[in-house]
């Protein structure tokens, strides 16, 4: 079956928007006014994964780009990282394990734990214009909550 | 909690439109598909299409495409789902229904549905 | 388009009894599989979602299963409430799909 997908940014729960920095990094810091348009659109596409109550498989590409957020090992660590595929086969519904997240989804906050390495989250530091990464801890000083906002 | 509010019954004319409401509340409206259902007199039930008043989304059947129009008002959180060119064999209840954005829910709320009457 | 083959049209039983109902999909559907009840004049009302998992407020008698592509819905212990028609929907692949209905009545 065809995947299904849907369009939609992302900001952490200090409001920072998530942006590009370079061709395979993304970072988050504030935005407003014009400045919003520089945000990234994610193309959030719904993907086969284990069965669970309160998660939800997802993938999420960048919209119009054939990259993908994907979880790897670099240097023993699991890592975050954009990866390129080949747009004629992506997105799919069996996305390989690294391009999947499990979406955690409580009173309209969002977390993306990896598939590949679970107990380990999409995050964000406090300080502004820092790379978006993997980080192995919730609740702690580095942020894994964020809120979406569907685009057209 | 929950609702779905449909319009009221309707009696329409061969080659008339009509246009049925689905008014919501009790949720964030933005974030559920808001889905339509047909059921003719006696028979089974028949997906229409879907909308996510988000984003504006919409996914038809096919076999509606041309029949049906659906839009939604996030103003007032009401969705619509319009019948052109009606003909006799459109005659029918129509449901408006709910699944979260994710798809994980299912149809979980339905209206009480409308009923279409086309009849010269 | 997918088909939902449900089985079978119609059921007759009696308060008590164990009754399951039937959908085969026609292709993997991958767990988004519903479950509804409708009475006559009424809306269907949720009762399963995604194969197995019950929709709040309906009774534990109710409950699913698969195998493949075969999709089960079972009423352990019939009560009189029950008697209505059941269908089955795929919402994987557009066009969502139901099943044909199953009419279950009391014999």
């Known amino acids: 079956a065809p995947v299904r997908s849907l369009h939609c940014t992302l900001r952490d729960a200090q409001l920072k928007s998530l942006v590009m920095s370079g061709p395979y990094e993304l970072k988050a810091l504030h935005l407003q006014g014009q400045d919003l348009e520089q945000q990234v659109v994610f193309s959030m596409s719904f993907v086969q994964g284990e069965e669970s109550n309160d998660k939800i498989p997802v993938a999420l590409g960048l919209k119009a780009k054939n990259l993908y957020l994907s979880c790897v090992l670099k240097d023993d660590k699991p890592t975050l990282q954009l990866e390129s595929v080949d747009p004629k086969n992506y997105p799919k519904k069996k996305m390989e394990k690294r391009f999947v997240f499990n979406k955690i989804e409580i009173n309209n906050k969002l977390e993306f734990e990896s598939a590949q390495f679970p107990n380990w989250y999409i995050s964000t530091s406090q300080a502004e214009s820092m790379p978006v990464f993997l980080g192995g801890t919730r609740g702690g000083q580095d942020i894994t909550d964020f809120t979406m906002q569907f685009v057209s | 909690q929950v609702q779905l509010v449909q319009s009221g019954a309707e009696v329409k004319k061969p080659g008339a439109s009509v246009k049925v409401s689905c008014k919501v509340s009790?949720?964030?409206?933005?974030?559920?598909?808001i889905e339509w259902v047909r059921q003719a007199p006696g028979k089974g039930l028949e997906w229409i299409g879907e909308i996510l008043p988000g984003n504006g989304n919409i996914n038809y059947n096919e076999k509606f495409k041309g029949k049906a129009t659906i839009t939604a008002d996030t103003s007032t959180d009401t969705a619509y789902m319009e019948l052109s060119s009606l003909r006799s064999e459109d005659t029918a209840v129509y449901y408006c229904?709910?699944?979260?954005?994710?798809?994980?829910?299912?149809?979980?709320?339905w209206g009480q549905g409308t009923l279409v009457t086309v009849s010269s | 388009d997918i088909q939902m083959t449900q089985s079978p049209s119609s059921l007759s039983a009696s308060v008590g009894d164990r009754v399951t109902i039937t959908c085969k999909a026609s292709q993997d559907i991958d767990r988004y599989l519903s479950w509804f009840q409708q009475k006559p004049g009424k809306a269907p009302k949720s009762l399963i979602y995604r194969v197995k998992r019950l929709v709040d407020g309906v009774p534990s008698r109710f409950s699913g299963s698969a195998s493949g592509t075969d999709y089960t819905l079972t009423i352990s212990s019939l009560q009189p409430e029950d008697f209505a028609t059941y269908y089955c929907?795929?919402?994987?692949?557009?066009?969502?799909?139901f099943g044909q209905g199953t009419k279950l009545e009391i014999k």
């Open positions: 009790g949720y964030t409206f933005s974030r559920y598909w």
């Open positions: 929907l795929q919402y994987d692949e557009f066009p969502y799909t």
């Open positions: 229904s709910t699944i979260y954005y994710d798809y994980d829910q299912g149809f979980t709320y």
